[in-house]
Interface confidence: medium
Amino acid sequence: LRLLDHRALVCSQPGLNCTVKNSTCLDDSWIHPRNLTPSSPKDLQIQLHFAHTQQGDLFPVAHIEWTLQTDASILYLEGAELSVLQLNTNERLCVRFEFLSKLRHHHRRWRFTFSHFVVDPDQEYEVTVHHLPKPIPDGDPNHQSKNFLVPDCEHARMKVTTPCMSSGSLWDPNITVETLDTQHLRVDFTLWNESTHYQILLTSFPHMENHSCFEHMHHIPAPRPEEFHQRSNVTLTLRNLKGCCRHQVQIQPFFSSCLNDCLRHSATVSCPEMPDTPEPIPDYMPLWEPRSGSSDYKDDDDKGSSHHHHHH
């Protein structure tokens, strides 16, 4: 979690002198409670916005907006603490609005916004706005919280943000998977414009079950520049295991901008429909011709049980 770096953070508006400060998320009013505290925020709204840094990078940000209740407690409102908690890591970042002048009622409801918390694709956050000072231990709460889910990089606007582009969001491999026979799958996909290797993970499952019965990993070496944006095809050899008929193919690129953390794309082949009168199948079909003197195991992850081509 971080703040967008692009300009001095502003919270002043007509009728209010205000400054934005870093916060430890532990306001002084927790330690030294006050007798009179303001009421809670009203109508807290969190939206996904996009903002550019000074360097021109585009980032998703949480746009936080709330209004004040129209009661006399605004006379005791000294500011607000904005807290963003990333739910999967428990990481928290806070800022504090510090009011340098007293608030007065005016003909419009007071409204505040803040759009400088940078958020990550496909993450969920809890956004809390605390009015300051915070209430005494048994006092009524004066905060409002909302959860906020950031879309992943498949989302049209997210796709062109810097974090998504860095993880390979602009690459559309357009995967097709075709069952050639009971023992072979053909995978076709479009290469990206970078000399980097790819990894294909084949995971097979029994019909209607979620524990895998077979895994095979295949390495595709970095294509040459003339092969960029071309289709590549790989033939994967399947293990002839009972009922292991649903196949998921996942392609992992290793682009320089994201290394091991690039977006992965996958496609699935369902189990074939069972015919009314099953055809007899041969008891055993060899998976490969053993190479003379070869002692390589060819099961879950051997390179030897697949081959690939790039073609224009």
Epitope: F214, E215, D283
Partner: antibody, heavy 116, light 107 residues
């Protein structure tokens, strides 16, 4: 060369848990799954389950489902097998082995004794 | 689950003899079968996979055959270091299962 080095012997009381580690070296850890096999004293081999070091997918023996958890730490190339609610008939040598279907390299084994 | 049955349970033989160990599956396992050798206090050692392919570093005196339900491990001329317990294992279907083992002892 490929090596799987397991943690040392353990003595546990019934109802307790044990966590056995298996540190792999000499190959790319995420390219191969790790299977776990146990052998009670004087008995044969029993397959316990498997974990993919790449995807984290697991497949456990039905009789151990709910009591066993297999995990990996790719940063240290280590696989772990935790068995909970131990009983006296869990006393065995526990082996980790490389691969999913058949096993080309084995750890040296970890003796787990369950006794009150 | 597929039950693997090995016979005999114990075999007493002299060095130099030809040894044939049998493994039977309760249903077809195609050729998805492996053989292991285990000596006291040691981890199993892979000998054969895919019913007939020797694992790395395994001497030519060990050979495997069979498919479907009946499999054989043959040691053409038994050496002193071959006295051990031998296990078969199927990997055609989950759960993976082992045979009960055949102990090859000195006559």
């Amino acid at each position: 060369q490929v090596q799987l080095v397991q943690s040392g012997a353990e003595v546990k009381k019934p109802g307790a848990s044990v966590k056995v580690s298996c540190k792999a070296s000499g190959y790319t850890f995420t390219r191969y799954g790790i299977s776990w096999v146990r052998q009670a004293p004087g008995q044969g081999l029993e397959w316990m389950g498997w974990i993919s070091a790449y995807s984290g997918n697991t497949n456990y023996a039905q009789k151990l489902q709910g009591r066993v958890t297999m995990t990996t730490d790719t940063s240290t190339s280590t696989a772990y097998m935790e068995l909970r609610s131990l009983r006296s008939d869990d006393t065995a040598v526990y082996y980790c082995a490389r691969r999913q279907l058949y096993f080309d390299y084995w750890g040296q084994g970890t003796l787990v004794t369950v006794s009150s | 689950e597929i039950v693997m049955t090995q016979s005999p349970a114990t075999l007493s033989v002299s060095p130099g003899e030809r040894v044939t160990l049998s493994c039977r599956a309760s249903q077809s396992v195609s050729s998805n079968l492996a053989w292991f050798q285990q000596k006291p206090g040691q981890a199993p050692r892979p000998l054969i996979y895919d019913a007939s392919t020797r694992a790395a570093g395994i001497p030519a005196r060990f050979s495997g055959s069979g498919s479907g339900t009946d499999f054989t491990l043959t040691i053409s001329s038994l050496q002193s270091e071959d006295f051990a317990v031998y296990y078969c294992q199927q990997y055609d279907n989950w759960p993976l299962t082992f045979g009960g083992g055949t102990k090859v002892e000195i006559k």
